[in-house]
Amino acid sequence: EDELQVIQPEKSVSVAAGESATLRCAMTSLIPVGPIMWFRGAGAGRELIYNQKEGHFPRVTTVSELTKRNNLDFSISISNITPADAGTYYCVKFRKGSPDDVEFKSGAGTELSVRAKPS
């Protein structure tokens, strides 16, 4: 059977400062069971951008409604983009673990570049 794939269709996205950036991500399956999180950067120093379960992410909204059944769309939108937001964003599927979830598969990443705000 086909294993879950994490699809980030855009390799890069360019957004003007002050605008919102939409970072797209889709899963091909509902299983294995476990959460999806967004990070900027890779490796040990990566920054958590969005985790629905815990944390406060006031600039991040999910593209699909949080109450949508059997959702496979895990795209997010980040508002009020600044140059400091530039970087590569990864959509990551975790496999449910006890007590800790285990990283299962990552998308290829989407590089966000920030253009100067039009004068």
Epitope: P32, K68, R69, N70, K96
Partner: antibody, heavy 119, light 108 residues
């Protein structure tokens, strides 16, 4: 959606049983599946859940019960070993459903199969 | 493990009346809570998920509310088929998935 459990019966303490759940009416391989049990006159108790290769168990059955699935047969199984009197219950098979970024609840249930552990 | 406490254990209501009962979680489960109905001799049936969303086909007289640790299921104008046991279930933090002990709604 239809879920039909079978394999229940009367077994002596220390014995084994294998429960089956035949699923139809949905794309079985795309969903996690769960066993929930109900002791006589008692409430509902989660037993085990399976995603793709990922399996999860209640502490009360860990090491004794094994959940598995055969996607080619649209069938869920629960192998129950070292059975105890406290395992006596109606065992329900349930289809998992998710809400967007959250965990699982159970949107379809079978009618259950009764397991009695008694000498 | 998150413990769900349902109250009251038994609720006696006359047909046509309103029934309200609660489910309290031992810790915050956000909106990750479902409600099930179980009629005598039958399997449980999903009524509500995400604390407040009615499952397809569930009558409008059933409504869920609350978030965090306090949740309520309300049945307006009880019908004869509504006399059953009602369970809440959290899916915020698992394993294990946990259920409340149930509220039995009986005819007054």
């Amino acid at each position: 959606v239809q879920l039909v459990e079978s394999g229940g019966g009367v077994v002596q303490p220390g014995g084994s049983l294998r429960l089956s759940c035949a699923a139809s009416g949905f794309s079985f391989s795309n969903f996690a599946m769960t066993w929930v049990r109900q002791a006589p006159g008692e409430g509902l108790e989660w037993v085990s859940t399976i995603g793709s290769g990922d399996t999860y168990y209640a502490d009360s059955v860990k090491g004794r019960f094994t959940i598995s699935r055969d996607n080619s047969k649209n069938t869920l199984y629960l192998q129950m070993n070292s059975l105890r009197a406290e395992d006596t219950a109606v065992y329900y098979c349930a289809k998992d459903s998710t809400v967007s970024w959250s965990g699982d609840f159970f949107d379809y249930w079978g009618l259950g199969t009764r397991v009695t552990v008694s000498s | 493990e998150i413990v769900l406490t349902q109250s009251p254990a038994t609720l006696s209501v006359s047909p046509g009346e309103r029934a309200t009962f609660s489910c309290r979680a031992s810790q915050n489960v956000k909106n990750d809570l479902a409600w099930y109905q179980q009629r005598p001799g039958q399997a449980p049936r999903l009524l509500i998920y995400a604390a407040r969303i009615r499952e397809t086909g569930i009558p409008e007289r059933f409504s869920g509310s609350g978030s965090g640790t306090e949740f309520t299921l309300t049945i307006t104008s009880l019908q004869s088929e509504d006399f059953a046991v009602y369970y809440c279930q959290q899916y915020y933090d698992w394993p294990p998935f946990t259920f409340g002990g149930g509220t039995k709604v009986e005819i007054k």
